[in-house]
């Protein structure tokens, strides 16, 4: 009976047994609902939508990291339907800590304002002085890890979202 | 029973406007991905738009020959579908359809269509 | 786009023969993405095969699919008066999603 299906399964009626719902490709995502023993009439995969991709099976289609804005970092190379962006290196005036845990956006540019000083990616872009560089407020005094939270927010989603 | 009922077809003068709306019931319409397809008289079937659901942010997709010109909405709480027509054209003359997304993209249910005839 | 070709434009059959239309992609098209619609004069299409090969609900069984690629194809193996109607297949491969010109099949 289809109460014992699993999640990724619906009821056949025709054999009696539960059946694996249809999987996804690469670039799509499940359509509808299927699993627990139920599968929608109109169930299947869609592609996904501009700026998401999926590896498929039963995955949903997530967001492009942005590399740029949420990283400030480039893009080594940009996403497509089946695979993520791939973050490069920081974006000017901005450097990734070193011996630093990844957090849970991963490798996170931090401003130069707040950098140490002789900071490799920084030097010649006055590392701790008050100069102005994208997307940062001269006269700030947050912390780095408070800097870089104050930038990533205002996003409209996670890099994984 | 799927149900899908265009209306706000007629006669309109070339570069005129035209609202569509496709009234639903029998299933659950917010889940759903929803599209707009045409026929002009004696013709094949044209594609025209499709608006994806609240979990995909409502996003839309066009034909490029419609694009900038017709918009596709959605309003979940009404359950209506519509399509606003601007710059209409001789060449817009067509029954209207509304339809069901299905998985892989087919059409699994349709309406009986509105007549949407540019005219001077 | 991708343009779909259906041949013939017209066909006319007997009942009780079998008969195959075509559908051409300009380019490869996923099969599970080909669909076929019928469509009877002055009447609403409705989904008649989906991805190939797969018989919507009430469709009779002497209605098949098959096509891989940029070749598709409809056959109904034994066709009877109500078939008489338009057939068009739809694909997507990617925006925007295009169907064919139809092929008209009648009975004699």
């Known amino acids: 009976e289809y109460s014992n299906c699993g999640e990724n399964e619906y009821y056949n009626q025709t054999t009696g047994l539960c059946q694996e719902c249809p999987p996804c490709g690469p670039g799509e995502e499940p359509y509808l609902s299927c699993g627990y023993g139920t599968k929608d009439e109109d169930y299947g995969c869609v592609p996904c939508p501009a700026e998401k991709f999926s590896k498929g099976g039963y995955q949903i289609c997530r967001r492009h990291k942005d590399c740029e804005g949420f990283f400030r970092a480039t893009v080594l190379t940009p996403g497509d339907m089946e695979n993520d962006a791939e973050c490069g290196p920081c974006l000017p005036g901005y450097y990734m800590l070193e011996n630093r845990p990844r957090n849970i956006y991963g490798m996170v540019c931090y401003s130069c304002l707040l950098a140490p000083p002789n900071t490799k990616e920084c030097v010649g872009a006055t590392s701790g002085a008050s100069a102005n560089f994208p997307g940062t407020s001269g006269s700030s005094t947050l912390s780095p890890f408070q800097h870089a939270h104050k930038e990533l927010s205002g996003q409209g989603h996670l890099a994984t979202a | 029973e799927v149900k899908l009922e265009e209306s706000g077809g007629g006669l309109v003068q070339p570069g005129g406007s035209l609202s569509l709306s496709c009234a639903t019931s029998g299933f659950p319409f917010s889940d759903y991905y929803m599209t707009w397809i045409r026929q002009p008289p004696g013709k094949a079937l044209e594609w025209l738009a499709l608006i994806r659901n609240k979990a995909n942010g409502y996003t839309t997709e066009d034909s490029p020959s419609v694009k900038g010109r017709f918009i596709i909405s959605r309003d979940d709480s009404q359950r209506i579908l519509y399509l606003q027509m601007n710059a209409l054209r001789d060449e817009d003359s067509a029954t209207y359809y509304c339809?069901?997304?299905?998985?892989?993209?087919?059409?699994?249910?349709w309406g009986q269509g509105t007549l949407v005839t540019v005219s001077a | 786009d991708i343009v779909m070709t259906q041949s013939p434009a017209i066909m006319s059959a007997s009942p009780g023969e079998k008969v195959t239309m075509t559908c051409r992609a300009s380019s490869s098209v996923s099969s599970s993405y080909l669909h076929w619609y019928q469509q009877k004069s002055g009447v609403s299409p409705k989904l008649w095969i989906y991805?190939?090969?797969n018989l919507a609900s009430g469709v009779p069984v002497r209605f098949s699919g098959s096509g891989s690629g940029t070749s598709y194809s409809l056959t109904v193996s034994s066709v009877e008066a109500e078939d008489a109607a338009t057939y068009y297949c739809q694909q997507y491969s990617d925006y925007p999603l295009t169907f064919g010109g139809g092929t008209k099949l009648e009975i004699k």
């Open positions: 991805s190939t090969s």
């Open positions: 339809a069901t997304v299905g998985g892989y993209y087919r059409f699994p249910s």
